[in-house]
Amino acid sequence: EEELQMIQPEKLLLVTVGKTATLHCTVTSLLPVGPVLWFRGVGPGRELIYNQKEGHFPRVTTVSDLTKRNNMDFSIRISSITPADVGTYYCVKFRKGSPENVEFKSGPGTEMALGAKPS
């Protein structure tokens, strides 16, 4: 089995208030089965940004069709960026578990920071 890797190619993403930010994440394997989630921050206080399995995330859309059985692209777009959105974003693979899924591997993170205001 190829060992799964989480690829977040950008270490830093400069964004503009009011615009849409795209956070990239791809995986190198579909196994083990389990969902991919996006968080801002680390540790117990991290904020859930997107869960492919469930939930309502009105400002978040996926770049790819996650219902494709061979999908390996879990990139997301966050609309209407505000200063409160800055931080480091991690895509995290969970493997299935009972009663709760188990964190399996995290991407290295992408820091979102505010760039210059549009002139």
């Epitope: 089965v33 469930e54 219902t67 494709k68 059985r69 061979n70």
Partner: antibody, heavy 118, light 107 residues
């Protein structure tokens, strides 16, 4: 209320074609992958084909590849199964089913009966 | 292929377990589907190994470990008489499969 309603079943002769439809309501159809599952008389369930939410990716069991085609029209909230070169072994009740995020099934239609007989 | 017993029986109030084997825990999710009569619409009682749809009674539960999944009905009732099919999605092959079905008789 979430509903899946199949139609298009009937009696056909071996070698003929049939197109099944599944009308979806009560949920955002364009956000879900869908599948067709059949059940031959006195037999168990058999998954046939699946299609991604956007319709670009399709998946089939080997025994129907090349004969059956799954498709969808998200503007009409409809799922289809085109069945060609039918044989008696295709006689079954055909169900459409909505997929969960991990490609299991959470809701099923009532089914439509296809009978292939000379 | 998924393997499950052809039949099980129980008295009302007893606990019933139906085991489905043949999958790989690493690559497989399981579901359980209830069919009360042949040709009638199946009803999903468990998906994603252990997730129960909101309209399914809490006496139905599911679990998975190793190469098997288990459907448990705690305090079985007469209305639970049905055929129960286990199903699986394999992330290696992108294919769904079903077991042959288990007929539950409530005595």
């Amino acid at each position: 209320d979430l509903q899946l309603v199949e139609s298009g079943g009937g009696v056909v002769r071996p070698g003929e074609s049939l197109r099944l439809s599944c009308a979806a309501s009560g949920f955002t159809f364009s956000s879900y992958a869908m599948s067709w599952v059949r059940q031959a008389p006195g037999k168990g369930l058999e998954w046939l084909a699946g299609i991604s939410a956007g319709g670009s990716d399709t998946y089939y069991i080997d025994s129907v590849k090349g004969r059956f085609t799954i498709s969808r029209d998200n503007s009409k909230n409809s799922l289809y199964l085109q069945m060609n070169s039918l044989t008696a072994e295709d006689t079954a009740v055909y169900y459409c089913a909505r997929e969960t995020w991990n490609h299991l099934f959470d809701y099923w239609g009532l089914g439509t009966l296809v009978t292939v007989s000379s | 292929a998924l393997t499950q017993p052809a039949s099980v029986s129980a008295n009302p109030g007893e606990t019933v377990k139906i085991i489905c084997s043949g999958g790989d825990y690493y690559s497989t999710y399981y579901g359980w589907y209830q069919q009360k009569s042949p040709g009638s619409a199946p009803v999903t009682v468990i998906h994603s190994d252990d997730k129960r749809p909101s309209d399914i009674p809490s006496r139905f539960s599911g679990s998975a470990s190793g190469s098997a999944a288990t459907l448990t009905i705690t305090g079985v009732r007469v209305e639970d008489e049905a055929v129960y099919f286990c199903g699986a999605y394999d992330g290696r092959t992108y294919i769904n499969t079903f077991g042959a079905g288990t007929t539950l008789t409530v005595l």
